[in-house]
């Protein structure tokens, strides 16, 4: 007797964060020789019996949670992990700043602050090259992402998004990129050097940063939460 069927994987290419009107492909991958795939959008009656969902142009109503499974003979696999497909560019971009500044010496502390003029209660911070954001629910239209005991690994390009807990898959456009520079000098310059270039956002390599809440009134517990559960 064969063992239980392994669950398939579900991925979004090139990314699960999809600007409105841009293409994305959801691909369900099971073992070789699968008889039938089923890919479904949760909290809706939408499903299709194939492994690939091609979206030529992202729309608001396509954002949400997806999962897939497959059938071999009469057996259905367990469902894949849920994939959360997010439409970005739905709202105006927030601003991202570093306190006390974007140049910080190794071992020091820095706080990245995401701010919006609108009443969003959720924020997500991305480091270029990391696969998942660091989410932080806050009030007062801003969120703080403290980085304690900075190391050279924290250098890089950061962006943040804002969104509402009532519509968790409809996000703002990304903030302009902020370049965090970690130096080995004893004194960090506080000169603001925010890069406004449109840098490429890739999700190929995985590095981790530690973010913990510092702002009064922020919820207890870690601010870092992997978006894909």
């Amino acid at each position: 007797q064969r063992g239980p069927l392994p669950k398939p994987s579900l991925q979004a290419l090139p990314s699960s964060l999809v600007p409105l009107e841009k293409p994305v492909t959801l691909r369900c991958q099971g073992p070789p020789g699968v008889d039938l795939y089923r890919l479904e959008k949760l909290s809706s009656s939408r499903y299709q019996d194939q492994a690939v969902l091609f979206i030529p142009a992202m729309k608001r109503h396509l954002a949400g949670r997806y999962r897939c499974s497959y059938q071999n003979g009469s057996l259905w696999s367990p469902p894949s992990d849920q994939l959360e497909l997010v439409a970005t560019g739905v709202f105006a971009k927030p601003s991202l700043s570093a306190q006390p500044g974007p140049a910080v010496s190794s071992g020091g502390d820095v706080t990245l602050q995401c701010q919006t003029r609108y009443g969003f209660d959720q924020f997500a911070l991305y480091k270029e090259g990391d696969p998942a954001p660091y989410k932080n629910p806050e009030r007062w239209y801003r969120a703080s992402f403290p980085i304690i005991t900075v190391t050279a690994a924290h250098s890089g390009t950061y962006r943040c998004y804002s969104f509402s807990s009532g519509d968790p898959y409809l996000w703002s456009a990304p903030s302009d990129p902020l370049e965090l520079m970690v130096t080995e000098f004893s004194e960090a310059t506080t000169e603001l050097t925010v890069s406004l270039t449109n840098k490429v956002f890739t999700t190929e390599t995985s590095r981790s940063i530690t973010a913990s809440p510092k702002e009064p009134g922020s919820p207890a517990g870690p601010a870092r939460q992997h978006y894909t559960k």
């Epitope: 293409p23 091609f54 449109n198 490429v200 956002f201």
Partner: antibody, heavy 119, light 107 residues
Framework: VTLKESGPGILQPSQTLSLTCSFS??????????VGWIRQPSGKGLEWLAH???????YYNTALKSRLTISKDTSNNQVFLKIASVDTADTATYYC????????????WGQGTTLTVSS | DIQMTQSPASLSASVGETVTITCRAS??????LAWYQQKQGKSPHLLVY???NLADGVPSRFSGSGSGTQFSLKINSLQPEDFGSYYC?????????FGGGTKLEIK
């Protein structure tokens, strides 16, 4: 897979251009398949005009959108493009091409049909 | 709209040489890029899709590379039938736009 464009050849300014793309070897009811229109003035580069997907979603060149209409007849394997109020700047060779979502490319092209707009 | 900047606009080379044509996108288009070859009086012909994949029947002397904003088409050991015009095109959201083209001529 083959595609073939047909059109009037010559039009006067302000007339409406009607183009037909007749194809074989694939179906526009197949998931992930589309047909697009591209034009090329003599000696110049290529310009994407419009395309239509298997599910009838349509997309247009921003600058020309108000003048363009794309449609399809799936059962007869045809795609149509209308361009309203043509001008001499619309003189070009018009191509239709198949689009396949895998790789997102124009993987098969027709031979082209030439339009001259002249008074 | 995404702009595609192709260079050089024209290029003279000899049979047997290796040439590279580049295409730069004004923003990240991931790998949503295709390359086409067009000979005088003929329709364009797909060479490379998804930035790096050779289309069916395309000789292996052609290769595509790049992702994000920088792309290139390399032709090793040029053959007489390779001379003509080459175009890149992005597919990352409409309007799909083409590069201005590169005319490859025999030296």
């Amino acid at each position: 897979v083959t595609l073939k464009e047909s059109g009037p050849g010559i039009l006067q300014p302000s007339q409406t251009l009607s183009l037909t793309c007749s194809f074989s070897g694939f179906s526009l009811s197949t998931y992930g398949i589309g047909v697009g229109w591209i034009r090329q003035p003599s000696g110049k580069g290529l310009e994407w005009l419009a395309h239509i997907w298997w599910d009838d979603n349509k997309y247009y060149n921003t600058a020309l959108k108000s003048r363009l209409t794309i449609s399809k007849d799936t059962s007869n394997n045809q795609v149509f493009l209308k361009i309203a109020s043509v001008d001499t700047a619309d003189t070009a060779t018009y191509y239709c091409a198949r689009i396949h979502y895998y790789g997102s490319s124009l993987d098969y092209w027709g031979q082209g049909t030439t339009l001259t707009v002249s008074s | 709209d995404i702009q595609m900047t192709q260079s050089p606009a024209s290029l003279s080379a000899s049979v047997g040489e290796t040439v590279t044509i580049t295409c730069r996108a004004s923003e990240n288009i991931y790998s949503y890029l295709a390359w086409y070859q067009q000979k005088q009086g003929k329709s364009p012909h797909l060479l490379v899709y998804a930035a790096t994949n050779l289309a069916d029947g395309v000789p292996s002397r052609f290769s595509g590379s790049g992702s994000g904003t920088q792309f290139s088409l390399k032709i090793n050991s040029l053959q007489p039938e390779d001379f003509g015009s080459y175009y890149c095109q992005h597919f990352y959201g409409t309007p799909w736009t083409f590069g201005g083209g590169t005319k490859l001529e025999i030296k």
